[in-house]
Interface confidence: low
């Protein structure tokens, strides 16, 4: 008996071939011997089966001795043995219809779980293997779960259902709702304007929700809410903002915040959360601000950084075009009695300069000038 696998909602074509290459009488019946369709001369006739309005054939093939049964908009319950009667012989075809659905919304937040459920006809014992967009293979039976979805899981999931050594492939588009970056770090000199950007890793027609930026300054004992905002159809409106610092927010996506100036008291870490309408859970992005200050007080030239720096970062003070006078894995370095000239304070990681501040040291009778 020939086995054909079909997909719920799809169209399937069951073949039936006669030895004579001409139009002769044929009938398609189900396992209960109820006629589905057949022919009378060159006309298609239909029987009283449940498939009535969804069953068809291709008259253009009859003259070649081919009498297919076409079933449209397949349902799981269409799974059955179909019998083609032609030339005093019977051809049996077993049709098994499967459906695969995401049992939740296909737009899921990062970190949430995806469950794929296989609908299958009674008596079948299929196996399912799904491949995520990043190529991970997941195997299962009637249900298949993936916990802790990541950004790379966005895209088309390809699932193969295997039954009787035949296979049918399903494609399910999954959108993982997340920020493009889980974390970012901004390095600024004291007094510079700071731009924070929070691009989303997905696009949807309408985006509505609300968000908040909580900030934990390095110098502060507790975190505080710097700004709250609403998002309606991709338009941003500020609800509440602190007086110090007075943040400004862009009115359109991507979410964009401006801090008028970087000051040591603002250095620290922030967590932007975004709650989307009709979604449980929130999107998160961490943002870090590192601030540098170079000062000269009497005979002491000092360079300091505030904020979440990694222990491997190097802070150096050097006279322009000369070797570093001092270089330490510390958050403050200084030089006593610095020579006159343009001094550079550098924050670097494995030789790559992340932040630089210049200060001009004048002869001892003058006062310092900050460029």
């Amino acid at each position: 008996k020939k086995v054909v696998l079909g997909k719920k909602g799809d169209t399937v074509e069951l073949t039936c071939t006669a030895s004579q290459k001409k139009s002769i009488q044929f009938h398609w019946k189900n396992s209960n011997q109820i006629k589905i369709l057949g022919n009378q001369g060159s006309f298609l006739t239909k029987g009283p089966s449940k498939l009535n309005d969804r069953a068809d054939s291709r008259r253009s093939l009859w003259d070649q001795g081919n009498f297919p049964l076409i079933i449209k908009n397949l349902k799981i319950e269409d799974s059955d043995t179909y019998i083609c009667e032609v030339e005093d012989q019977k051809e049996e075809v077993q049709l098994l219809v499967f459906g695969l659905t995401a049992n939740s919304d296909t737009h899921l937040l990062q970190g949430q779980s995806l469950t794929l459920t296989l609908e299958s006809p009674p008596g079948s014992s299929p196996s399912v293997q799904c491949r995520s967009p990043r190529g991970k293979n997941i195997q299962g039976g009637k249900t298949l779960s993936v916990s802790q979805l990541e950004l790379q899981d966005s895209g088309t999931w390809t699932c193969t259902v295997l039954q009787n050594q035949k296979k049918v492939e399903f494609k399910i588009d999954i959108v993982v709702l997340a920020f493009q970056k889980a974390s970012s770090i901004v390095y600024k000199k004291e007094g510079e304007q700071v731009e924070f950007s929070f691009p989303l890793a997905f696009t949807v027609e309408k985006l509505t929700g609300s968000g908040e930026l909580w900030w934990q300054a390095e110098r502060a004992s507790s975190s505080k809410s710097w700004i709250t905002f609403d998002l309606k159809n991709k338009e941003v409106s500020v609800k509440r903002v602190t007086q110090d610092p007075k943040l400004q927010m862009g009115k359109k996506l991507p979410l964009h915040l401006t801090l008028p100036q970087a000051l040591p008291q603002y250095a620290g870490s922030g967590n932007l959360t975004l709650a989307l309408e009709a979604k449980t859970g929130k999107l998160h992005q961490e943002v870090n601000l590192v601030v540098m200050r170079a000062t000269q007080l009497q005979k002491n030239l000092t360079c300091e950084v505030w904020g979440p720096t990694s222990p491997k970062l190097m802070l150096s003070l050097k006279l322009e075009n000369k070797e570093a006078k001092v270089s330490k894995r510390e958050k403050a370095v200084w030089v006593l009695n610095p020579e006159a000239g343009m001094w550079q304070c550098l924050l670097s990681d494995s030789g790559q300069v992340l932040l630089e501040s210049n200060i001009k040291v004048l002869p001892t009778w003058s006062t310092p000038v900050q460029p």
Epitope: Q129, G135, K136, N137, I138, Q139, S147, Q148, E150
Partner: antibody
Framework: EVQLVESGGGLVQPGGSLRLSCAVS????????MHWVRQATGKGLEWVST???????YYPGSVKGRFTISRENAKKFLYLQMNSLRAGDTAVYYC????????????WGQGTTVTVSS | EIVLTQSPGTLSLSPGERATLSCRAS???????LAWYQQKPGQAPRLLIY???SRATGIPDRFSGSGSGTDFTLTISRLEPEDFAVYYC?????????FGPGTKVDIK
């Protein structure tokens, strides 16, 4: 420095059990797929098991039902529980890290020897 | 199960020569899922190539990978003394994630 250090190998009788451990350092363990691969003396490499970041596990038919891979993200440990051991399981067992952006085992431990003999 | 066949079993060459190693899969796999490793006696394997043609970190550019479908190739353009070793291909296309039997490159 990224490091994988296996332990727990030894001599065990057929039908016995062993638990291999792999201590991880130098990277965010929870973000990576992890693998066990074995190699019998003078033979090629044989994939033994994989555990994904979501805890999804994979085994070849030769060990399915006998071996169990698990991970303890907080402690940065990968384990391989081996039951109903057979002489054919005698090998050096390596733990390896799966690539983050690609498929390939990019960091390997030095291996631990398992001998199944009466 | 996808079976990987490597040929030749042994390749005897001199330093400076070009080495061409073949890996054939019993069914078509996406190049994303093919990797090559090098193993020297008493050492753990080392990843050379992932995605059939991308060099892993720190791998010299004399190593290159190519191929698609069922036929993949590892080429060492000019053999250095340290390149004499056993080379394995591996597929991640579907579980079980099989290795090839290996090709030994030894000094002529």
């Amino acid at each position: 420095e990224v490091q994988l250090v296996e332990s727990g190998g030894g001599l065990v009788q057929p039908g016995g059990s062993l638990r291999l451990s792999c201590a991880v350092s130098g990277f965010t363990f929870s973000s990576y797929d992890m693998h066990w691969v074995r190699q019998a003396t003078g033979k090629g490499l044989e994939w033994v098991s994989t555990i994904g970041t979501a805890g999804d596990t994979y085994y070849p038919g030769s060990v399915k039902g006998r071996f169990t891979i698990s991970r303890e993200n907080a402690k940065k440990f990968l384990y391989l529980q081996m039951n109903s051991l057979r002489a054919g399981d005698t090998a050096v067992y390596y733990c390896a890290r799966g690539g983050y952006y690609y498929y390939g085992m990019d960091v390997w431990g030095q291996g631990t020897t398992v001998t199944v003999s009466s | 199960e996808i079976v990987l066949t490597q040929s030749p079993g042994t390749l005897s060459l001199s330093p400076g020569e070009r080495a061409t190693l073949s890996c054939r899969a019993s069914q078509s796999i996406s190049s994303t899922y093919l990797a090559w490793y090098q193993q020297k006696p008493g050492q753990a394997p080392r990843l050379l190539i992932y995605g059939a043609s991308s060099r892993a970190t720190g791998i010299p550019d004399r190593f290159s990978g190519s191929g698609s479908g069922t036929d993949f190739t590892l080429t060492i353009s000019r053999l250095e003394p340290e390149d004499f070793a056993v080379y394995y291909c591996q597929q991640y296309g579907s579980s079980p994630f099989t290795f090839g039997p290996g090709t030994k490159v030894d000094i002529k």
